[in-house]
C-alpha cells in the first residue's frame, strides 16, 4: 500500500515527487526543484508539510485524479496519498489534460467491457503493480470512504442511518465532524462538540495505517525511517527520536513498537522493510547515437548488488504528460535540438526511496535540403550550380556529380552558395546531388537536392587504328576505329583523298569503312580520315599510300 494520510491531514513524502496529473499543485505538496542537465538524485532533505487540522478536507471528488484526500475514519481505511504531485514543471500539460500510464502487459488484468460502461475494469488485485498514480481515481468504496462533490456520498442506499466520525484534532475525538449517511445515500456533514472524552482506541488501531518515508544518508549508507504521524510517538527500546528511526541497514527488516498516551495497548508493531541503498541505482541515458536527434531512452541501472527482493521494486517515469511504469523508456518523434525533462522515481514496496530528473537535449537533426537555384553547363568542360542553404544547422556541403557510372564527390565549405565544376567531359549528362551535413553524435546527412545538365559539344578525338589496303591495282580499302570521345550528338566518318594538293575524293559514311575505286595507277595518295559529331570535326588521321603499275 502507498502512504496513507495521518489522522489530522495529508502528509507529503519528503522527496520531491514526479508530477503525474493535471491540476495545479496543492498547497501541501513538495514539487521538484529544477533538475540538473545531467542527473539529480535527491538527498531527502526537504521538510514535511502537512495540512493543519482546520484544513482537513471535507469533500472528495471521485473524478479528481490527484487530490485524493478523504476522512481518516474508524473502520474504513484511508485514501492513499499519491506520491506524485502535479504541474511541477513547465512541460506538464495545461489544465484539462491528463497523464496516462504506459506499462507493459499486465498478465492478470482484463479488458472486459461491462454493459453501459466504457472503462476498463480495475478490480482490486488485478493490477500488475500497486499503483500510486494520481491517474487512478479515488480508491473504490470497498476500501475507502470517498465523498463526492456537493457532499453526495457515492455509497449504496442503507436501511438505517450510519454515523462515521472523522478526526480533526490531535486530542482524539475531543472535537469532531460527523458525517451522517441517510438511507438515500446523501451525506450531511455537521460539526458538534462532544463534552465527554470517550474511551481511547488501541495504538494498534490508531496507527494501523501509519506510513513511512525513508531518508538515505550517502555518507553512512544508512536509512532513517520517518514515521508520518502528527504527535510525538514513543517506540519500544527507545528506537526512535522525533518520530524517526535511525541507522537502518538496506534490505533488512526492523521491528518498531509504537505507542502514545492517546491510545492504549496493544502497541502498534510496525515492520520496516528497508529499501536498497540509493547509490545502487543510476539513471542512464540509453539513447542510440544514430537516433539521438529525435529519440530519448532512459533506463535505471542496478550498478551494485543488493539483497532486497527486486520483485518489490517498481520504477516510474514521467515525461511531459506521458507516464510509464517501466525500468526503461523510449520516446520517439521528438524535435531535434530541444531540451526534454523526464522525472523518475523508484519505489520499494510502494514506498518511494529515490528519484531523479534528467534534462536531455536531443542531438542536432539532419539539416534540411538545400534549394538549388540553377544548374547548367556553361561550356564543354564546365558547369555551374548555385543554391540557397538549408534553414537548420549544418557544418558543410557535399556535392556529388555522376556521369554514367562514375561518381565524384567534393566537400564544400558551409558558406558557399555557388560552385563551378571544371574538367568535365563534353556532351555528357551529369547528375548532381547536393546535401548539407552536420557532425553531431554521428554525421547526419540532410536530404539531397538533385539536378542535371549536359555539357556542350567539343571536337571529337581522333579516329584510330586506321588502315589503308590495296584491293586491286586502282582500288583501296580504308578502315578505322571510332574515336574514344565523340563529344557530340551525331556520328559520321569522313574520308578525304588527296593527290598532291588536289582533293580527289571526299566521302562520308556511317561507319569507318571506305572502298575507294578508280584511282590513278602509280600515284601517291594522302588518305585523311576523321570523325564528325554533328557540331565539330575531329583531328584527321593521315596515311600515305601509292597505287601500283597496272598489272595488265
Amino acid at each position: 500500500q502507498s502512504p496513507t494520510p495521518s489522522p489530522t491531514g495529508l502528509t507529503t513524502a519528503k522527496m520531491p515527487s514526479v508530477p503525474l496529473s493535471s491540476d495545479p499543485l496543492p498547497t501541501h505538496t513538495t514539487a521538484f526543484s529544477p533538475a540538473s542537465t545531467f542527473e539529480r538524485e535527491n538527498d531527502f532533505s526537504e521538510t514535511t508539510t502537512s495540512l493543519s487540522p482546520d484544513n482537513t478536507s471535507t469533500q472528495v471528488s471521485p473524478d479528481s485524479l490527484d487530490n485524493a484526500s478523504a476522512f481518516n475514519t474508524t473502520g474504513v481505511s484511508s485514501v492513499q496519498t499519491p506520491h506524485l504531485p502535479t504541474h511541477a514543471d513547465s512541460q506538464t500539460p495545461s489544465a484539462g489534460t491528463d497523464t496516462q500510464t504506459f506499462s507493459g502487459s499486465a498478465a492478470n488484468a482484463k479488458l472486459n467491457p461491462t454493459p453501459g460502461s466504457n472503462a476498463i475494469s480495475d478490480v482490486p488485485g488485478e493490477r500488475s503493480t500497486a499503483s500510486t498514480f494520481p491517474t487512478d481515481p479515488v480508491s473504490p468504496l470497498t476500501t475507502t470512504l470517498s465523498l463526492a462533490h456537493h457532499s453526495s456520498a457515492a455509497l449504496p442506499a442503507r436501511t438505517s442511518n450510519t454515523t462515521i466520525t472523522a478526526n480533526t484534532s490531535d486530542a482524539y475525538l475531543n472535537a469532531s465532524e460527523t458525517t451522517t449517511l441517510s438511507p438515500s445515500g446523501s451525506a450531511v456533514i455537521s460539526t458538534t462538540t462532544i463534552a465527554t472524552t470517550p474511551s481511547k482506541p488501541t495504538c494498534d488501531e490508531k496507527y494501523a495505517n501509519i506510513t513511512v518515508d525513508y531518508l538515505y544518508n550517502k555518507e553512512t549508507k544508512l536509512f532513517t525511517a520517518k514515521l508520518n504521524v502528527n504527535e510525538n510517538v514513543e517506540c519500544g527500546n527507545n528506537t526512535c527520536t522525533n518520530n524517526e528511526v535511525h541507522n537502518l541497514t538496506e534490505c533488512k527488516n526492523a521491528s518498531v513498537s509504537i505507542s502514545h498516551n492517546s491510545c492504549t495497548a496493544p502497541d502498534k508493531t510496525l515492520i520496516l522493510d528497508v529499501p536498497p541503498g540509493v547509490e545502487k541505482f543510476q539513471l542512464h541515458d540509453c539513447t542510440q547515437v544514430e537516433k539521438a536527434d529525435t529519440t530519448i531512452c532512459l533506463k535505471w541501472k542496478n550498478i551494485e548488488t543488493f539483497t532486497c527482493d527486486t520483485q518489490n521494486i517498481t520504477y516510474r517515469f514521467q515525461c511531459g504528460n506521458m507516464i510509464f511504469d517501466n525500468k526503461e523508456i523510449k520516446l520517439e518523434n521528438l524535435e531535434p535540438e530541444h531540451e526534454y525533462k523526464c522525472d523518475s522515481e523508484i519505489l520499494y514496496n510502494n514506498h518511494k526511496f529515490t528519484n531523479a530528473s534528467k534534462i536531455i537535449k536531443t542531438d542536432f537533426g539532419s539539416p534540411g535540403e538545400p534549394q538549388i537555384i540553377f544548374c547548367r553547363s556553361e561550356a564543354a568542360h564546365q558547369g555551374v550550380i548555385t543554391w540557397n542553404p538549408p534553414q537548420r544547422s549544418f557544418h558543410n556541403f557535399t556535392l556529388c556529380y555522376i556521369k554514367e557510372t562514375e561518381k565524384d564527390c567534393l566537400n564544400l565549405d558551409k558558406n558557399l552558395i555557388k560552385y563551378d565544376l571544371q574538367n568535365l567531359k563534353p556532351y555528357t549528362k551529369y547528375v548532381l546531388s547536393l546535401h548539407a551535413y552536420i557532425i553531431a553524435k554521428v554525421q547526419r546527412n540532410g536530404s539531397a537536392a538533385m539536378c542535371h545538365f549536359t555539357t556542350k559539344s567539343a571536337p571529337p578525338s581522333q579516329v584510330w587504328n586506321m588502315t589503308v589496303s590495296m584491293t586491286s591495282d586502282n582500288s583501296m580499302h580504308v578502315k578505322c576505329r571510332p574515336p574514344r570521345d565523340r563529344n557530340g550528338p551525331h556520328e559520321r566518318y569522313h574520308l578525304e583523298v588527296e593527290a598532291g594538293n588536289t582533293l580527289v575524293r571526299n566521302e562520308s559514311h556511317k561507319n569507318c569503312d571506305f572502298r575507294v575505286k578508280d584511282l590513278q595507277y602509280s600515284t601517291d595518295y594522302t588518305f585523311k580520315a576523321y570523325f564528325h559529331n554533328g557540331d565539330y570535326p575531329g583531328e584527321p588521321f593521315i596515311l600515305h599510300h601509292s597505287t601500283s603499275y597496272n598489272s595488265k
Epitope: 491528463d98 511531459g320 530541444h338
Partner: nanobody, 123 residues
C-alpha cells in the same frame, strides 16, 4: 460522454499491413494522451503504442518492444482521430485492438476505451 470507436481491423496475411483508426468525441482530443492497447485471447492487455506531449513535441510517441519499428501511432487533431499503422504483421499480433484515452473521470489502468476492432494475422 467520452466515445471512442475503432475501425480498420480485419484478416491479413503475415507480412501484410493494416491501418486502424479511432474516432474520438466527448472530450478535448488534442490535449489527451492516447494509446492503442491490445488483448490477445487468454492474455492480459498490452499497451503497444502511446502518443502524448513532451515539451514542445506534441506528437511524442512510445512503443512496446514487440512492435517498435513495425507500428506507427499518429493523430489527426483536426478530425479527432487516432491512427495505428501496422506493417510487417506477425501471427502474434492477432488480438482485439482498443483505442484508449485517459480522460478526467475515467477509471482503470488505461482509462476510457472503445469497443475494439479484431485484427487476425493468419495465412
Amino acid at each position: 460522454e467520452v466515445q471512442l470507436e475503432e475501425s480498420g481491423g480485419g484478416l491479413v496475411q503475415p507480412g501484410g499491413s493494416l491501418r486502424l483508426s479511432c474516432a474520438a468525441s466527448g472530450f478535448t482530443f488534442s490535449n489527451q494522451v492516447m494509446s492503442w492497447v491490445r488483448q490477445a485471447p487468454g492474455k492480459g492487455p498490452e499497451r503497444v503504442a502511446v502518443i502524448g506531449s513532451v515539451g514542445g513535441a506534441t506528437g511524442a510517441t512510445s512503443y512496446a518492444d514487440s512492435v517498435r519499428g513495425r507500428f506507427t501511432i499518429s493523430r489527426d487533431n483536426a478530425r479527432s482521430t487516432l491512427h495505428l499503422q501496422m506493417n510487417s504483421l506477425k501471427p502474434e499480433d492477432t488480438a482485439v485492438y482498443y483505442c484508449a484515452a485517459r480522460v478526467r473521470g475515467s477509471t482503470g489502468d488505461f482509462g476510457s476505451w472503445g469497443q475494439g476492432t479484431q485484427v487476425t494475422v493468419s495465412s
